[in-house]
Amino acid sequence: YNNFRKSMDSIGKKQYQVQHGSCSYTFLLPEMDNCRSSSSPYVSNAVQRDAPLEYDDSVQRLQVLENIMENNTQWLMKLENYIQDNMKKEMVEIQQNAVQNQTAVMIEIGTNLLNQTAEQTRKLTDVEAQVLNQTTRLELQLLEHSLSTNKLEKQILDQTSEINKLQDKNSFLEKKVLAMEDKHIIQLQSIKEEKDQLQVLVSKQNSIIEELEKKIVTATVNNSVLQKQQHDLMETVNNLLTMMSTSNSAKDPTVAKEEQISFRDCAEVFKSGHTTNGIYTLTFPNSTEEIKAYCDMEAGGGGWTIIQRREDGSVDFQRTWKEYKVGFGNPSGEYWLGNEFVSQLTNQQRYVLKIHLKDWEGNEAYSLYEHFYLSSEELNYRIHLKGLTGTAGKISSISQPGNDFSTKDGDNDKCICKCSQMLTGGWWFDACGPSNLNGMYYPQRQNTNKFNGIKWYYWKGSGYSLKATTMMIRPADF
């Protein structure tokens, strides 16, 4: 019936052409370059928080949109005027022609134009909505920017105050360090003064010692003189006694000279009828040399020679080789009988060794070795033990086979360290081994976690320092 065509002319304006019979109607409509067509998809700018668009750019875009709006409005007005003008012209033509069918065409054209106008209006409404959306988005972005800016400003203020605090603290510490340096210098000076004073004191003491040594020499000389006098007196007394006994013998021949009895060990003392605990004088085997020892005449049948006792920490056991050789301490209290005597004694016949132990909780235990002897001094009084029984552990806390004896001045252990110096006291150290009954004496509540205490590992562990210990020997055939 009719042909309606839409095309673009060479200058980019939209061209509407209506063909009806022999008549052709062409309408040229102005096209706005800045107006986005409804068919093209709208792509919004994805805005992320804290990554704002430039404020000036947003303002510029708003201005562009306002211009577009204004242009569109003008264009609508022009369109309306254009349509009205055309309508007037068409009406005059219609009236002049007075042709019925042309009226219908004009009505149709009018309808088309109205439809187009409606479509344009709808497009404009869309554009307006888009502009509003964009404006809202921009406002939100601006709000976000301002919030972000406030947040940053707050953070900067916080950091600034923190920096100020740190600076204050730093200056305070600097002052403190300077004060400490001053104090340190003063202390160093006082230490130096003390050192000088001590050196003076030491030199004074040295001179006093020298004087004392001279006095000792003099005293020794005097002592020798006194000893000679005493010897002479004794000889005189003996002569007198001899004379008296001779004269008495002449008068009473029944009086015999009293025999001097000597005992090798406490077993012999016991067998001679002395069954009371106490200190007795013993004689070295094959010698006239004497030694005082404590004899236990009650425990386990009696006859025990006590060779070591610890009970109260009253005696220092960090002694020299010579002191351990000859013995030290008090036989009625803490003491060491002496390695030389024990070595000579235990090499004469078979001896048993009993070690009696007490802890701080009231418990007692013992280790009994059915064979015991000490080697000679040439072999560093090496201990030899066999046949372990008792309640203080099924494994011997004195390393087997026995080790050499070590003291602070005689290092014979199997350690690159010096066990005697490290653990204190003389003992048959291994490297350094599971026992040391001659270690430091620690009182109750200070006796745990002590590596250098009185130790018997296979009864109480490595860090426990015992309350009391007794080492005693007796012939195996007693």
């Epitope: 090499n347 059915e370 064979h371 002897y373 080697s375 000679s376 040439e378 072999l379 090496r382 030899h384 066999k386 046949g387 372990l388 029984t389 099924k394 494994i395 011997s396 087997q400 086979p401």
Partner: antibody, heavy 112, light 107 residues
């Protein structure tokens, strides 16, 4: 420490077996006990006796009547004499040092 | 005298195996028990003394334990060179006595 046995390989029944053990690297008078042990065919081991560093001796009761262990300290040697031997005494004879001087003990050094 | 009963008499093992030998004393021997190794044509060598003490230079694959009458000797990982006869010995009372021996053979 080294120990070396020496003596005749064959002894006629009823005669005496005499063996020597020469010790090098340690003085037999210093410490320890110096033993004689024998091993019968079938690998059974028997301790015979020792002489201690001090010169005291100890013997296996099963041999007591016919065994004697002596020493020569100047040569650092000790000796075994077993009298009235029989074919039952056929064995490998070892000398050895024990770790205890006055009593029987484990033996840490053996002859060849 | 104390009789030492050693078991087993023979052990057939492969290299890498763990082996255990036991010795039972007829009366208490305290901890005075030693273990020896005798390789073919050689004299016995001390491995363990006082029941559990490893002798100088003895590899730690050899271990001993026990007290009183029951004693155990073990080789954790048998090696070819461990082919030998192993003896236990008590020296708690005189005369010292030996076990009958355990022959260790490698498959």
């Amino acid at each position: 420490v080294q120990l070396q046995e020496s003596g005749p390989g064959l002894v006629k029944p009823s005669q005496s077996l005499s063996l020597t053990c020469t010790v090098t690297g340690y003085s037999i008078t210093s410490d320890y006990a110096w033993n004689w042990i024998r091993q019968f065919p079938g690998n059974k081991l028997e301790w015979m006796g020792y002489i201690s560093y001090s010169g005291s001796t100890s013997y296996n009761p099963s041999l007591k009547s016919r065994i004697s262990i002596t020493r020569d300290t100047s040569k650092n040697q000790f000796f075994l004499q077993l009298n009235s031997v029989t074919p039952e005494d056929t064995a490998t004879y070892y000398c050895a040092r024990s770790t205890f001087g006055h009593y029987v003990s484990s033996m840490d050094y053996w002859g060849q | 005298s104390i009789v030492m009963t050693q078991t087993p008499k023979l052990l057939l093992v492969s290299a890498g195996d763990r082996v255990t030998i036991t010795c039972k004393a007829s009366q208490s021997a305290s901890n005075d028990v030693a273990w020896y190794q005798q390789k073919p044509g050689q004299s016995p060598k001390l491995l363990i003394y006082y029941a559990s003490n490893r002798y100088t230079g003895v590899p730690d694959r050899f271990t001993g334990s026990g007290y009183g009458t029951d004693f155990t000797f073990a080789i954790s990982t048998v090696q070819a060179e461990d082919l030998a006869i192993y003896f236990c010995q008590q020296d708690y009372s005189s005369p010292p006595t030996f076990g009958g021996g355990t022959k260790l053979e490698i498959k």
